[in-house]
């Protein structure tokens, strides 16, 4: 699978994707904020 995440539990896999999505959203917001402040 694409990013090397490995888990035997499907629910754990979904949780990992949710965390990844959350982090992407937070980091994306921070990046936009930094660009705005420049």
């Amino acid at each position: 699978h694409s990013d090397g995440i490995f888990t035997d539990s499907y629910s754990r896999y979904r949780k990992q994707m949710a965390v990844k999505k959350y982090l992407a959203a937070v980091l994306g917001k921070r990046y936009k904020q930094r660009v705005k402040n420049k």
Epitope: H1, S2, S9, Y10, S11, R14, K15, M17, A24
Partner: antibody
């Protein structure tokens, strides 16, 4: 209401590849877990793999590892399943299905792939 | 892989009578999140499968209440309390707890 519409039936030669599409409407495609399941004639169901379109993250059944590729095009809300090195045993109806609550809530109508020389 | 064993393979029941299908998994399907990802599907000839039951006992909306799911751990049951003509189909259990996701072999329900 989520709807999944799959591409039409295919007849393929042994050793070739097939690519089946599944177009989703009425839901958030990118944030869905899209699975592929197949059913050989008169047989049971077999899970092939999944894709999470936001990250294009895939997970494949061991049996199909190296032979199946699942992709997604977020711009058209379409998932694809490509199976290579086809053999007669791959003759089956191929379904896409979307997960909700850890279970397949929505299914495509199925695509019959016939492998014959 | 988790092996899902369904019994019986086929079942003939009189209209209005109870139909019981069993499903056994080779490993517990209780997940670390407290849920049991055991599902039941109904498939009629020439149609895609349809979700009936998920989380072992939660009925899909719109599914008649004559269908019920029960069980925990490794042993599960689908019960049709009063068989109707439109219930003639193949029923599959499948587990969504562990990769690879796996299905039972199916139970064909017919009218006696």
């Amino acid at each position: 209401e989520v709807q999944l519409v799959q591409s039409g039936a295919e007849v393929k030669k042994p050793g070739s590849s097939v690519k089946v599409s599944c177009k989703a409407s009425g839901g958030t495609f990118s944030d869905s877990y899209m699975h592929w399941v197949r059913q050989a004639p008169g047989q049971g169901l077999e899970w092939m793999g999944l894709i999470y379109p936001i990250f294009a993250d895939t997970r494949y059944a061991q049996k199909f590892q190296g032979r199946v590729t699942i992709t997604a095009d977020e711009s058209t809300s379409t998932a694809y399943m490509e199976l290579s090195s086809l053999r007669s045993e791959d003759t089956a109806v191929y379904y896409c299905a979307i997960d909700q609550d850890g279970s397949f809530a929505y299914w495509g109508q199925g695509t019959l792939v016939t492998v014959s020389s | 892989d988790i092996v899902m064993t369904q019994s019986p393979d086929s079942l003939a029941v009189s209209l209005g009578e109870r139909a019981t299908i069993n499903c056994k998994s080779s490993q517990s399907l209780l997940d670390s999140d407290g849920k049991t990802y055991l599902n039941w599907l109904q498939q009629k000839p020439g149609q895609p499968p349809k979700r009936l039951i998920y989380w072992a006992s939660t009925r899909e909306s719109g599914v008649p209440d004559r269908f019920s799911g029960s069980g925990s751990g490794t042993d599960f049951t689908l019960t049709i309390s009063s068989l109707q003509a439109e219930d003639v189909a193949v029923y599959y259990c499948w587990q969504g707890t562990w990769f690879d996701l796996t299905f039972g072999g199916g139970t064909k329900v017919e009218i006696k």
